[in-house]
């Protein structure tokens, strides 16, 4: 039988009446154009909804927008368009919501042609009131809040000026001209690139990277010949043009740009790109594009300095610059990432790593599932997950994979079972152990969301026809119940729940269409009465993450430690609640050679865990050798994997080698080498 169709499925009793009493409809009395929705703050219940409607006239476009506010998670909305003087809001800038629970909101208005500058509306009380402010410039980008102080804003103007406000947009000051890209760093630092001659495009590869730590009083040039820059975790990266040709390579800094080291990564040509896939304070995943228009590249993982890189995954699918990659951080379990590779026969296959990129494998075939008819071997195939690439290819995939840090182990995704990703209509699969094992959860494509830290999963079928039914599960997707939330079906456009998966409320957005008009409508369902009681100690069970073999002494050890979690029992129908905190207990593991990566100048032969000295340095190894800082060329061959907490056990101590000797081998004469080193 299909998932959840079992007569013996655990059922929530009398749920129809409970949900009917907690279903709230709101019809928006304006025409259907586009709608954008933002939560203001965490656990405040405040939602802002901006509806916009464009009427293209002969010479210009006439636009109308309306602003609505809810303070009860979307059950009721109030039209507050008058608070912004009925001004048309520019949707491409969205609603700039302040960090944390600052309660700050900035809306950027559309202003008529000849004005001196733009206009914003500012609120610092969770959108109860707005202040209109005319700007001395026309904004090119959305206002960017400093992560450390929400009163500090920066924006780029259409004339490439860098503007800063220290009083939440009340007053603005241009701190630099000819700016291409600007980003907040830590401690209210601003990093930005500038051009000298023509424009950002013309000067690409000849840009300068600047830093200001005092909001524009003083500046320091921290890089030249810059192509682009990026921030990830505690790392600052810049791609820098080579002296002699059109290639560029990555340099990295961990001290805000005061000192730089060359990353031991391949250089790339004009048509190639680098991309930071994920970064934290320990390490970074870097994608390096392959030469030519291949649509793939290589993933490298860094050491703790961001300098030495290990090849992690070949043929990683990433379409040309700014394109699509399926790389997904599974936030519900430490160390887990999912992505796609382009195989030799041009089919796309899903790969998963459980140890932060150390090893990649195919996803295990779900129990009780058949391999697709096209599979070479009917018994041996894998689950393949649809993500951004499938969505970009307009396959019948309404949502990317979903995981939440507070819903431990749960991953939900569209997928198909076979040798590769299929263009057939996918089903929805769920893993409750962070991707080790999978089960078919729902037949056909669906929208889905996680509520109450995993206590409830909600889904809506993806259909071109109007819908009026929502499905929900209280046991991590094993059993499903359906609820008809309205008599009159609506054209569904989206599911919305408060970010963080702690809420018990879900909003179903759509529009109704009649002979003459169409209107936006939302239905907000509160599941609080389905989960009648608060969870108690007896509702939780203990679970060891990353467990694959209980007979192995180090079962569950990933990156040097194992973690046990208290997890809600599937049979418990109770509220985790908004204040739920994941209970976990780490225990340190003994070190093995797998807890170490090979340092610069060393490599692991296939099927060997020991790091062996490279007989000769070639390619980017040699370049690193030439341009690398001296202290990075002294090594014992091993470095602990970033974030690895192992203790005792194997300690690969060996004599410290000075690799500078290799650098002055027969590749380059010492004079040449000295003149090039920095």
């Amino acid at each position: 039988s299909a998932p959840g169709e079992d007569e013996e499925c655990g059922r929530v009793r009398d749920f129809v009446a409970k949900l009917a009493n907690n279903t709230h409809q709101h019809v928006f009395d304006d025409l259907r154009g586009s709608v954008s929705l933002s939560w203001v703050g965490d656990s405040t219940g405040v939602i802002l909804v901006l509806t916009t409607f464009h009427v293209p006239l002969v010479i210009m476009t006439f636009g109308q927008s309306k602003l609505y506010r809810s303070e009860d998670y979307g059950k009721n909305f109030k039209d507050i368009t008058d608070l912004i003087n009925n001004t048309f809001i520019r949707t491409e800038f969205g609603m700039a919501i302040g960090p944390e629970n600052s309660g700050k909101v900035v809306l950027t208005a559309e202003v008529s042609g000849g004005s001196r500058g733009g206009r914003i509306f500012r609120s610092s009380d969770f959108a109860k009131n707005f202040v209109q402010t005319d700007l001395p410039f026309h904004p090119l980008t959305q206002m960017m809040y400093s992560p450390q102080n929400s009163d500090y804003l920066l924006a780029l103007s259409t004339e490439n000026g860098l503007w800063v406000s220290k009083n939440f947009g009340g007053k603005w000051e241009e701190i630099h001209k000819a700016v291409c890209l600007a980003k907040w760093g830590s401690d209210n630092t601003i990093f930005f690139t500038t051009y000298a001659n023509g424009s950002c495009k013309a000067d690409l590869g000849a840009l300068e990277l600047w830093r200001t730590s005092d909001l524009g009083k003083s500046f320091k040039t921290i890089g030249v010949k810059i192509y682009s820059f990026g921030l990830g975790g505690r790392f600052l990266f810049a791609s820098v043009m080579a002296d002699k040709d059109t290639t560029r390579r990555i340099h990295v800094s961990t001290d805000q740009g005061d000192t730089w080291s060359m990353a031991q990564l391949p250089s790339v040509g004009q048509e190639q790109f680098y991309s930071i896939l994920a970064a934290n304070d320990d390490m970074v995943f870097m994608h390096v594009d392959e030469p030519g228009d291949t649509g793939f590249g290589t993933i490298f993982t860094s050491d703790d300095r961001g300098i030495v890189y290990s090849k992690s995954l070949d043929r990683h699918l990433y379409t040309t610059t700014g394109g699509e990659t399926d790389f997904t951080n599974v936030t519900s379990l430490r160390g887990v990432y999912i992505t796609s590779v382009l195989s030799e026969d041009n089919s796309i296959q899903t790969m998963i790593t459980f140890d932060q990129g150390g090893r990649w494998t195919h996803l295990r075939k779900p129990e009780n599932s058949e391999c697709a008819a096209t599979a070479k071997n009917k018994n041996e195939c894998s689950l393949h997950i649809h993500a951004s690439y499938s969505i970009s290819q307009k396959l019948n995939v309404p949502m990317a994979p979903l995981s939440e840090p507070n819903a431990v182990g749960i991953v939900i995704a569209h997928g198909s079972v076979g040798d590769a990703i299929s263009v057939m209509v996918p089903d929805v699969y769920i893993s409750d152990d962070g991707g080790y094992s999978w089960t078919k959860m729902l037949e056909g494509p669906h929208y889905y969301t996680i509520l109450d830290s995993g206590g409830i999963i909600v889904a809506i079928e993806h259909s071109s026809r109007p819908i009026n039914v929502i499905k929900f599960s209280t046991d991590e997707g094993q059993c499903w119940q359906t609820y008809t939330f309205t008599r009159d079906p609506i054209y569904f456009t989206g599911l919305a729940s408060e970010p963080g998966a702690r809420s018990m409320n879900i909003s179903i957005w759509g529009f109704t269409e009649s002979f003459l008009t169409s209107q936006w409508v939302s239905y907000t369902i509160d599941f609080k009465d389905i989960l009648e009681r608060n969870c108690e100690e007896k509702d939780y069970t203990i679970w060891l993450a990353h467990s694959t073999d209980p007979e192995d002494y180090e079962d569950g050890c990933i990156l040097g430690y194992k973690e046990q979690f208290l997890r809600l029992r599937k049979s418990s129908v109770c509220q985790n609640g908004r204040d739920y905190v994941v209970t976990k207990q780490p225990s340190i593991c003994l070190c093995s050679l797998e807890d170490f990566l090979c340092d610069f100048g060393y490599y692991r032969p296939e099927n060997d865990s020991k790091c062996v000295e490279q007989p000769e340095l070639k390619g980017h190894d040699l370049e690193f050798c030439l341009y690398g800082r001296e202290e990075h060329l002294t090594t014992n061959g091993y470095r602990k994997i970033p974030g690895d907490k192992c203790q005792g056990g194997v300690n690969p101590v060996r004599e410290v080698k000075d690799l500078k000797k290799k650098c002055t081998s027969n590749f380059l004469s010492p004079e040449k080498q000295n003149s090039k080193s920095n």
Epitope: Y436, T541, W543, S547, P550, R569, S571, Q585, S587
Partner: antibody
Framework: QVQLVQSGAEVKKPGSSVKVSCKAS????????ISWVRQAPGQGLEWMGG????????NYAQKFQGRVTITADESTSTAYMELSSLRSEDTAVYYC?????????????????WGQGTTVTVSS | DIQMTQSPSTLSASVGDRVTITCRAS??????LAWYQQKPGKAPKLLIY???SLESGVPSRFSGSGSGTEFTLTISSLQPDDFATYYC????????FGGGTKVEIK
């Protein structure tokens, strides 16, 4: 092959405490939960509680909460069950059992290895 | 706590008979059910875990089925060694056992 060897029979007075040990050999003690189950004469099986040696996470059946303490010593691969405020109805055979495990869940797969049982008699 | 009701409490059968014991949970426990066999003076022995998975070394005449709240242990052809007491045990809440079914010679 994993074995669980329990301490010998005990005779106790009402109101006193008893501590039964369960030593594991031949397996990875730390990676499995150990449960304690008792069986009064002519009666069925009754779960008292369990412990996971890594981290020492113990949980108890409601009936015994506050009266039973389960501990584990990883270094000697030994689990202990102490029952206090003994009464005559606590006369039973006390078993320790290893919870089989196929995934990360400790208690879901049945008890695959049992100790030989320890008879505790409570009598004045 | 989840209650487990086992039936019958006693069952008389002959060698070669097909024997069925049922166990009902007071709420859904998915497939988290185990079956044990116990002989007088001995510790229980695990037969079935996760409702239908046969423990290694257990004869294939033993089988388990069910999910949610209704479960069954079946002995396809009763052997002399099978006369014993059988217990079901749920593992999705704090562990609880059924009251037991004594299989005796008819």
């Amino acid at each position: 092959q994993v074995q669980l060897v329990q301490s010998g029979a005990e005779v106790k007075k009402p109101g006193s405490s008893v501590k039964v040990s369960c030593k594991a050999s031949g397996g990875t003690f730390r990676n499995y939960a150990i449960s304690w189950v008792r069986q009064a004469p002519g009666q069925g099986l009754e779960w008292m509680g369990g412990i996971i040696p890594i981290g020492g996470w113990a949980n108890y059946a409601q009936k015994f909460q506050g009266r039973v303490t389960i501990t584990a010593d990883e270094s000697t691969s030994t689990a202990y069950m102490e029952l206090s405020s003994l009464r005559s109805e606590d006369t039973a055979v006390y078993y320790c059992a290893r919870q089989g495990r196929k995934t990360g869940y400790y208690y879901y797969y049945g008890m695959d290895v049992w100790g030989q049982g320890t008879t505790v008699t409570v009598s004045s | 706590d989840i209650q487990m009701t086992q039936s019958p409490s006693t069952l008389s059968a002959s060698v070669g008979d097909r024997v069925t014991i049922t166990c009902r949970a007071s709420q859904s426990i998915s497939s988290w059910l185990a079956w044990y066999q116990q002989k007088p003076g001995k510790a229980p022995k695990l037969l079935i875990y996760k409702a239908s998975s046969l423990e290694s070394g257990v004869p294939s005449r033993f089988s388990g089925s069910g999910s949610g709240t209704e479960f069954t242990l079946t002995i396809s052809s009763l052997q002399p060694d099978d006369f014993a007491t059988y217990y079901c045990q749920q593992a999705d809440g704090h562990i609880t056992f059924g009251g037991g079914t004594k299989v005796e010679i008819k």
